[in-house]
């Protein structure tokens, strides 16, 4: 059962923690047994991987989302689940793997050339009235998130950040602009090398929150310039 899995003391031997005060990696004694993760219609086995309990999508990795592991299961227990690949069923964007988004309950590619016509059509449909948003676009958050938002809330159409509620900014999403959450500490951010590069993004991120700046993740200094990962960090 899920509870017995969560209570397992076994943990995979992973690289050292990412810094800060996380200076105490647990002594790995054995690998956890293969665990079943929902992956579309069939369950996929991910060997030697211990479930990671979560409360929000932001706690999970980039290739995961936070949800109850069983359909209609214990609503109080959520873990990070492997993201859904293209053509798999979804309820929100966070469920789909990077490079995909949730459209009509299915993960589809966000490749701008292939899907441009379809996406523009979607935006016209979705923003045709004040009560709908882009195919249930929402922050990477739990399944209880509302699919519809009032003006100024997450997912609402905007022209500038002042149109959005506190804690949100106005950022491009496909070929429209909607209110998105200002980034938290530790979240991946976009560092623009030259002026005007904002215009190239179809999934524009908000800026980092107060007291934070977008800087290279310490562990990624050795990476090549093109692949350096930037995150919101304290000044």
């Amino acid at each position: 059962t899920l509870n017995s899995v969560l209570n397992s003391n076994a943990i995979k031997n992973l690289p050292p923690p990412l810094g800060g005060a996380a200076g105490h990696p647990g002594s790995a004694v054995s690998a956890a047994p293969g665990i079943l993760y929902p992956g579309g219609n069939k369950y996929q086995t991910i060997d030697n991987y211990q479930p990671y309990p979560c409360a929000e999508d932001e706690e999970c990795g980039t290739d995961e989302y936070c949800a109850s592991p069983t359909r209609g299961g214990d609503a109080g227990v959520q873990i990070c689940l492997a993201c859904r690949k293209r053509r798999k069923r979804c309820m929100r964007h966070a469920m789909c793997c990077p490079g995909n988004y949730c459209k009509n309950g299915i993960c589809v590619s966000s490749d701008q050339n292939h899907f441009r016509g379809e996406i523009e059509e979607t935006i016209t449909e979705s923003f045709g009235n004040d009560h709908s948003t882009l195919d249930g676009y929402s922050r990477r958050t739990t399944l209880s998130s509302k699919m519809y938002h009032t003006k100024g809330q997450e997912g609402s159409v905007c022209l500038r950040s002042s149109d959005c509620a506190s804690g949100l900014c106005c950022a491009r999403h496909f070929w429209s602009k909607i209110c998105k959450p200002v980034l938290k500490e530790g979240q991946v951010c976009t560092k623009h090398r030259r002026k005007g590069s904002h215009g190239l993004e179809i999934f524009q991120r908000c800026y980092c929150g107060e007291g934070l700046s977008c800087r290279i993740q310490k562990d990624h200094h050795q990476a090549s310039n093109s692949s350096r990962l930037h995150t919101c960090q304290r000044h």
């Epitope: 990412l18 005060a21 932001e58 990795g61 562990d219």
Partner: nanobody
Framework: EVQLVESGGGLVQPGGSLRLSCVAS????????LKWVRQAPGKGLEWVSH????????MYAASVKGRFTISRDNAKNTLYLQMNSLKPEDTAVYYC?????????????????RGQGTQVTVSS
């Protein structure tokens, strides 16, 4: 720099109670879900409990459900764990932890930010 400092551990008899505290700094406390994990001697990390950023939802491992209560005070940047009806098998070092955020492809307890931990020993 993310810092988490736990306190409140100690030696207690079976059936006794303890209240652990964790003071956090270096990040916006009220914006992050937090958790307690523990590590028994010679064992790996075990998730104990979880609380959402605003404290409206909690989760517990089956082994502690009904005995432990997690809570937080966002005004004081403090996380708590009230432990009642303690058992010898609860003996462990208890860590307050926060996710590292979306900087890894797969999250793991090993990659969390944690404090130094506080020792809880349940013995008669």
């Amino acid at each position: 720099e993310v810092q988490l400092v736990e306190s409140g551990g100690g030696l207690v008899q079976p059936g006794g109670s303890l209240r652990l505290s964790c003071v956090a700094s270096g990040f916006t406390f009220s914006m992050w879900p937090l958790k307690w994990v523990r590590q028994a001697p010679g064992k790996g990390l075990e998730w104990v409990s979880h609380i959402t950023s605003n404290g409206d939802r909690t989760m517990y491992a089956a082994s502690v459900k009904g005995r432990f209560t997690i809570s937080r005070d966002n005004a004081k940047n403090t996380l708590y764990l009230q432990m009642n009806s303690l058992k010898p098998e609860d003996t462990a070092v208890y860590y307050c932890a926060r996710s590292a955020g979306q900087v890894v492809s797969r999250a793991s307890l090993e990659n969390d930010y944690r404090g130094q931990g506080t020792q809880v020993t349940v013995s008669s």
